[in-house]
Interface confidence: medium
Amino acid sequence: VPRWRQQWSGPGTTKRFPETVLARCVKYTEIHPEMRHVDCQSVWDAFKGAFISKHPCNITEEDYQPLMKLGTQTVPCNKILLWSRIKDLAHQFTQVQRDMFTLEDTLLGYLADDLTWCGEFNTSKINYQSCPDWRKDCSNNPVSVFWKTVSRRFAEAACDVVHVMLNGSRSKIFDKNSTFGSVEVHNLQPEKVQTLEAWVIHGGREDSRDLCQDPTIKELESIISKRNIQFSCKNIYRPDKFLQCVKNPEDSSCTSEI
């Protein structure tokens, strides 16, 4: 009797997922000498152990604890950049501003960035056909639980002034349902974090509105203030110029507002 594989609504595991994770791990540890001690084979074994043979709708943060332990990394707690719905620009920024870090600049974030994975209950197979979709199937799936776990830990580690890059082109500039809105905001530690500074990135060249007055930003300010953390907000009207000025701060055109 053929055993019918569970059909999920989301895309299946990324092609050559094990190789990609292992290759990324080695590359990361080579580029970051402070992580040279990490045994990438053990990292892969721990990653695999978090979801293989488990029902892909029944994954817990505990499943990822062995991986979290192996990937423990100290980043400067006052140099953390969070982002929501504007990943590419955030990554371009930290590529230039090398002393600041997004989650994807850490080992665990780098390993999983843009990848999808899931297994099947009671078999050692990786499911390359389909994986659960967060909305249509279940929220406790391997990918969602992974990002919830690493995002929580990343936010908990932050201190002093924490920056967040937000997409001003979206209808909800601050979205309570995003990873930032549902996980990171609530795990910033008031005893360590003094200020959350939002950078609202404008999309249109002619957009001169003050998006810091947007209702969703006011909602974010309210949530943050209730947590005894100060809030500030800046409009980034010209993201291209912003990046250019990060690269060349002495440029004369960089004194004006960006």
Epitope: R16, E19, T20, L22, A23, R24, C25, V26, K27, E30, I31, P33, R36, C40
Partner: antibody
């Protein structure tokens, strides 16, 4: 048996570019890092950069950043190194070399035969 | 970047004698060090990796030692085919860097 076969010698004018290829056979091309190492006449070895074909994200030595482009084509198991804005000091034998372990960039256990690039006006 | 310094630049040895080559790193490279042999007109050949592990097919007369910043390659009894240039290379920190080489010549 792993073999790395490089393209033939090139003579180039200053300011131009050169693209050297390195075709691999045997082993899994995608998983082993390929590096490029050059050796000027009578001089030592100099690492230029490397790539894990599966990832397609090269890493370059600072000295060559902006002038060198390393790529890999998994479908043909071929790695490429392009060096632009050539000057006479770039006259050298250029080697491709494969990492000793899967996924790791070094040390190098397999080497191409070398490609002599001469830059002269 | 890590600077690798080899000494001596040239070593004159008689066949059958022992040769000792040194390599110093400007900062610790742990045991992530390799030794290569290169003969004129040929590509380098990996001899030792991990500071002390012989690569496949390398004769037992070649041995490596050291860790951190000081490394040694020893050829216990030089054969005629061992006269060549030897390079050390660190692969602990990007960019990988090589020493300037030690030429082992016939005395």
């Amino acid at each position: 048996q792993v073999q790395l076969v490089q393209s033939g010698a090139e003579v180039k004018k200053p300011g131009s570019s050169v693209k050297v290829s390195c075709k691999a056979s045997g082993g899994d091309f995608s998983l082993y890092a390929i590096s490029w190492v050059r050796q000027a006449p009578g001089q030592g070895l100099e690492w230029m950069g490397g790539i894990i074909p599966l990832l397609g994200e090269p890493v370059y030595a600072q000295k060559f950043q902006g002038r060198v482009t390393i790529t890999a084509d998994e479908s043909t198991s071929t790695a490429y190194m392009e060096l632009s804005s050539l000057r006479s000091e770039d006259t050298a034998v250029y080697y491709c070399a494969r990492g000793h372990r899967v996924y790791s960039s070094s040390p190098f256990d397999y080497w191409g035969q070398g490609t002599l690039v001469t830059v002269s006006s | 970047e890590i600077v690798m310094t080899q000494s001596p630049a040239t070593l004159s040895v008689s066949p059958g004698e022992r040769a000792t080559l040194s390599c110093r790193a400007s900062q610790s490279v742990s045991s992530n060090l390799a030794w290569y042999q290169q003969k004129p007109g040929q590509a380098p050949r990996l001899l030792i990796y991990g500071a002390s592990t012989r690569a496949t097919g390398i004769p037992a007369r070649f041995s490596g030692s050291g860790s951190g910043t000081e490394f040694t390659l020893t050829i216990s009894s030089l054969q005629s085919e061992d006269f060549a240039v030897y390079y050390c290379q660190q692969y602990n920190n990007w960019p990988w860097t090589f020493g300037q080489g030690t030429k082992v010549e016939i005395k």
